[in-house]
């Protein structure tokens, strides 16, 4: 059952110009961890769950083998007794990078390029999306999601990592951007603003939305996140804007109702499994896509960004709960956790639908300025 969504037909955003980034520097969280699959009998997971850098921390993932499923590491190392039938043993090790990406923050020192040189790259995220300049690409088919419907048990880890609130996803959530472009979901997290100040990362014609959800995926071509970092298409993020609507969003309420439990930085709780796809817009066929980066250190490039045209609606109270409950480092509220938009530097944003065509009566023959790069696909 779908929750109320909006903006089903018209391209996202209005013509109004959102406020400029309140952040001096480009700052953002890192795509975080995700768990491993179940061990087969006799092999309970022995995960090395460490922090991996990136858009809210990225976990390590072990590929499916005959007897295990895909594995994904989490933040903190834990070692347990042997023996779980559906939890393949996790022996993969995450190689820590030389730079310490754990010490960064939004809007201040140290400058992100000092934390990770990739943050000064030419093809960074987020970006401002201008539908009129997007290249309509008919080859971009509707996204396919499989296994995103989770029963209440086992429960999922919801964590305040000081940069965002992050939900670690179990193995088996499969996503396809198209034929041969297959991914596994690792985690999801949110970006938001503050009272009266929007906090989405991406913008549409300069308009910033109240908040934004990111679902981070690892390509099935890679066994581990650190192998995929910086590789074209190694990681993919599904992004959707959150807007204010008249009704409570029941899917989001399952997470938002637990935020008080993790108000303190570094705290976590367990939440019942839920329909992860219900956190996304219902229209998987209309979206923008471009190649960018993680929006937090290490800012690795080669990330395929898919930004839904349709938005997700939350009540005003829910948006307030999101932006006004969590605390970050140094006794400061966890707010405005978004990075400034980055220059396209010649990149072309593709659209799966003719976004440049304004359907309003005053539109005369609109011109699509950019052509689809994947036209031959």
């Amino acid at each position: 059952q779908r929750l109320p969504r909006m903006q089903e037909d018209s391209p996202l955003g209005g013509g109004s110009s959102g406020e400029d980034d309140p952040l001096g520097e480009e700052d953002l969280p890192s795509e975080e961890d995700s768990p491993r699959e179940e061990d087969p009998p006799g092999e309970e997971d022995l995960p090395g769950e460490e922090d991996l850098p990136g858009e809210e921390d990225l976990p390590e993932v072990k590929p499916k083998s005959e007897e295990e499923g895909s594995l994904k590491l989490e933040d903190l190392p834990t070692v347990e007794a042997p023996g779980d039938p559906q939890e393949p043993q996790n022996n993969a090790h995450r190689d820590k990078e030389g730079d310490d990406q754990s010490h960064w923050r939004y809007g201040g020192d140290p400058p992100w390029p000092r934390v990770s040189p990739a943050c000064a790259g030419r093809f960074q995220s987020p970006v401002d999306i201008r539908p009129q300049l997007a290249a309509f690409c008919p080859a971009l088919r509707p996204l396919e999601l499989l296994g995103f419907q989770l029963p209440p048990l086992p429960e999922l880890r919801l964590r305040n990592n000081g940069h965002s609130v992050q939900l670690t996803l179990p193995p088996g959530l499969e996503m396809a951007l198209g034929p041969g472009r297959e991914y596994r979901a690792l985690q999801l997290h949110l970006h938001w603003g503050a009272a009266g100040r929007p906090g989405s990362e991406h913008t549409v014609e300069g308009h910033r939305f109240p908040a934004e959800i990111h679902v981070v995926h690892l390509s099935t071509a890679f066994a581990r996140v650190d192998e995929a970092l910086g590789r074209p298409g190694g990681l993919a993020v599904l992004a959707a804007f959150l807007e204010e609507g008249p009704e409570e969003n029941s899917a989001y309420e399952q997470l938002l109702s637990r935020l008080e439990e993790i108000a303190e930085e570094g705290s976590e709780t367990q939440v019942p499994g839920l329909d992860i796809s219900a956190l996304l817009p219902s229209d998987f066929s209309r979206y923008f896509q471009y190649e960018g980066s993680l929006t937090t250190p290490p800012c690795a490039q080669g990330v395929i960004w898919t930004v839904f045209n349709q938005t997700v609606m939350l009540s005003a109270k829910q948006l307030h709960t999101l932006s006004d409950t969590l605390w970050g480092p140094g006794d400061s509220r966890l707010q405005l956790n978004f990075r400034a938009t980055q220059p396209l530097n010649g990149r072309v944003i593709e659209a799966s639908f003719p976004a440049g065509v304004d359907s309003s009566p005053r539109a005369a023959e609109p011109v699509q300025l950019n052509s689809c790069l994947a036209a031959g696909d």
Epitope: D84, P85, Q86, P151, L153, P154, E155, P170, P272
Partner: antibody, heavy 119, light 110 residues
């Protein structure tokens, strides 16, 4: 290795009560959700109840809701099923099972304990 | 009447291949919930055979495989052996009924 051992079964009259226990070892008990599944003589498997690792969330089949209570003592690595207002149709072998950390499958099962409800 | 429907029995000769179907509805398998398979040898507790539609726990031979499509799932057993004679159950989650099992399928070797 993972071991689950049920106990507490036996013969009870209709309307009576019984408390089943499941002693767990070989894994970090508090990290895993647990479940009870039963099997009537000569019949198939029927899910009865489940509980989260912390014990904060519990779930029941409609057939036992209001009569059975699942609980756990993580300090004792033990899962419980308190069965009240027992009926003849509750007669079955009761298994405790360990739910996976990332899968809803039941990866390990105990050997079961027989509950007979009869006058 | 089980929420997930399995054939009551299947049979095959040693070395042959058999499949066991598990048919659900839009509130369970069709809604995207994973399917798991269990083997119960006579007089013993069930044992996990396939989890999350297609994955085999360690120790389960490659002769056993699972698949899922739309509102149904299947368990395939190739190279049938005498000790495969058992009851097989599928299990999933149902949005209205919580965890659900199929009625079970008795595999008999000819």
């Amino acid at each position: 290795q993972v071991q689950l051992q049920e106990s507490g079964g036996g013969l009870v009259q209709p309307g009576g009560s019984l408390r089943l226990s499941c002693a767990a070892s070989g894994f970090t008990f508090s990290s895993y959700a647990m479940s009870w599944v039963r099997q009537a003589p000569g019949k198939g498997l029927e899910w009865v109840s489940a509980i989260s690792g912390s014990g904060g969330s519990t779930y029941y089949a409609d057939s036992v809701k209001g009569r059975f209570t699942i609980s756990r003592d993580n300090s004792k690595n033990t899962l419980y099923l308190q069965m009240n207002s027992l009926r003849a149709e509750d007669t079955a072998v009761y298994y405790c099972a360990k739910i996976g950390r990332y899968s809803s499958s039941l990866g390990y099962w105990g050997q079961g304990t027989l509950v007979t409800v009869s006058s | 009447q089980s929420v997930l429907t399995q054939p009551p029995s299947v049979s095959g000769a040693p070395g042959q291949r058999v499949t066991i179907s598990c048919t659900g509805s839009s509130s369970n398998i069709g809604r995207g919930y994973n399917v798991h398979w269990y083997q119960q040898l006579p007089g013993t507790a069930p044992k996990l055979l396939i989890y999350d539609n297609t994955n085999r726990p360690s120790g389960v031979p490659a002769r056993f495989s699972g698949s899922k499509s739309a509102t149904s799932a299947s368990l395939a057993i190739t190279g049938l052996q005498a000790d495969d004679e058992a009851d097989y159950y599928c299990q999933s989650y149902d949005s209205g009924l919580r965890w659900v099992f199929g009625g079970g399928t008795k595999l008999t070797l000819l």
